[in-house]
């Protein structure tokens, strides 16, 4: 045996954003003929010798970071990328609004504002059909997501979540959808890839912050966070059952 065994992949099905009360399964996938899988939950560290974890009813205590490894003979693999399992619907939904308007002429600027009834300091903005989310911490009680020089690619349906940085895996219900319409177009735009859209790959299974030039704020550049793996496209539709 030269070098460690390659890491397995860990995925949440159907999604790593799980409404309270819903079911989810975590699956660790290694090469064929693995002797033993170990699935770990972090904080506090605990483990099961299984290649899957079925959670029939999502609870707050299930949220957190998971990773897995496998053993062949006496050798252990590298650990998988960590999977962040997020419980949603823990708090009331925030409100999402567009300023100055949700109908924006092409080339103009618009700010999407996510406001929570709680003093949360973290907000996540999702666009339906995209594999990425815009995420940034904000002081005070609101999060502004400025979109500078709007293009056709920005039109679509957006939702936001809010949460506290002290409990980063317990999120609110999603906001009601906000439809951003980019006006002054000759035809309905197709969903074209932009710098805000990143395919979810093995390496982005653990949300990672990627810089972008497209989105900016008055304070500092906006970051784009690759979304948790396993959301069934189109992205936002997996969560519509929240809006009751």
């Amino acid at each position: 045996q030269s070098g460690p065994l390659p890491k397995p992949s860990l995925q949440a099905q159907p999604s790593s954003l799980v409404p309270l009360g819903q079911s989810v399964i975590l699956r660790c996938q290694g090469p064929p003929d693995v002797d033993l899988y170990r699935l770990e939950k972090l904080k506090p560290e605990k483990y099961e010798d299984q290649d899957f974890l079925f959670i029939p009813t999502m609870e707050r205590s299930n949220a957190g970071r998971y990773r897995c490894s496998y053993q062949n003979g006496s050798h252990w693999s590298l650990p998988s990328d960590q999977l962040e399992l997020i419980a949603t619907g823990v708090y009331a939904k925030p409100s999402l609004s567009a300023h100055p308007s949700s109908a924006v002429p092409q080339g103009r600027d618009v700010t999407l504002k996510c406001q929570s009834p709680y003093s949360f300091d973290e907000f996540v903005l999702y666009k339906e059909g995209d594999t990425g989310s815009y995420k940034r911490p904000e002081k005070w009680y609101r999060a502004n997501f400025p979109i500078i020089t709007v293009t056709a690619a920005h039109s679509g349906t957006y939702r936001c979540y809010s949460f506290s940085s002290s409990s980063p895996y317990l999120w609110s219900a999603p906001s009601d959808p906000l439809v951003l319409v980019v006006t002054g177009l000759s035809a309905t735009p197709s969903q074209v890839p932009t710098e805000e859209s990143f395919p979810v790959t093995e390496s982005s299974r653990r949300p990672s912050i990627l810089p972008t030039n497209k989105i900016s704020t008055t304070e500092k550049p906006m970051n784009i966070t690759a979304s948790p793996e396993g959301l069934s496209p189109p992205f936002g539709f997996a969560h519509q059952h929240y809006a009751k």
């Epitope: 506090p44 560290e45 605990k46 483990y47 099961e48 010798d49 490894s69 053993q71 252990w76 650990p79």
Partner: antibody
Framework: QVQLVESGGGLVKPGGSLRLSCAAS????????VSWIRQAPGKGLEWVSA????????QYAESVKGRFTISRDNAKNSLYLQMNSLRAEDTAVYYC????????????????WGQGTLVTVSS | QSVLTQPPSVSGAPGQRVTISCTGS?????????VHWYQQLPGTAPKLLIY???NRPSGVPDRFSGSKSGTSASLAITGLQAEDEADYYC???????????FGGGTKLTVLG
């Protein structure tokens, strides 16, 4: 109450073999990971081997790999350590210890220990 | 050579506060694994003292406390008593080979 009682220690010559036993009581033995941990005279603790509840998951410290075999008999609530090719540096008190468990999860620490059995490897 | 590093000995007078450090690496404590502490009184088996970095099992006095930061952890004992004289071991888990690792142990002497 939880009890772990080791036995089988004694004096053995280098290259010889010995089989240690640990009798468990006061808990559902087959649900728990258990380990062997040793302590050389005047020295610190060294984890030796661990085994999962069903007996299929086993792990060994590098220092004993290929020489020691851990096993269990859940029907007898017993844990075993077969020690072959013994060396002077294997001289120690051998403890069996239970890993803490809560619901379906195992934890990486030991909540109950036996009183230990002394193994002396000397010619 | 133990995987986790502890001072061989510490001492203090009755009523004083002492701390015992435990230093690991990026593959054990630094990989996110918790640190646990055991007390071994002379001639007896080790006993769980602190689990999950800072939690006390029932029956352990609140004079004992633990903390963890980065790749190291520490055990603090306040209001030192004669019966605290013992060996103290830290323990964690190593991600590389999935093995359980201990510190070399620290002998606590209560002076006077």
């Amino acid at each position: 109450q939880v009890q772990l009682v080791e036995s089988g220690g004694g004096l053995v010559k280098p290259g010889g073999s010995l089989r240690l036993s640990c009798a468990a009581s006061g808990f559902s033995f087959g649900d728990y990971y258990v380990s062997w941990i040793r302590q050389a005279p005047g020295k610190g603790l060294e984890w030796v081997s661990a085994i999962g509840g069903s007996g299929s998951a086993v792990q060994y410290a590098e220092s004993v790999k290929g020489r020691f075999t851990i096993s269990r008999d859940n029907a007898k609530n017993s844990l075993y350590l077969q020690m072959n090719s013994l060396r002077a540096e294997d001289t120690a008190v051998y403890y069996c210890a239970r890993h803490y468990r809560e619901f379906r999860w195992h934890y990486y620490y030991f909540d109950y220990w036996g009183q230990g059995t002394l193994v002396t490897v000397s010619s | 050579q133990s995987v986790l590093t502890q001072p061989p000995s510490v001492s203090g007078a009755p009523g004083q506060r002492v701390t015992i450090s435990c230093t690991g690496s990026s593959s054990n404590i630094g990989a996110g694994y918790d640190v646990h502490w055991y007390q071994q009184l002379p001639g007896t088996a080790p006993k769980l003292l602190i689990y999950g970095n800072s939690n006390r099992p029932s029956g352990v006095p609140d004079r004992f406390s633990g903390s963890k930061s980065g790749t190291s952890a520490s055990l603090a004992i306040t209001g030192l008593q004669a019966e605290d004289e013992a060996d103290y071991y830290c323990q964690s888990h190593d991600l590389g080979a999935h093995v359980w690792v201990f510190g070399g142990g620290t002998k606590l002497t209560v002076l006077g």
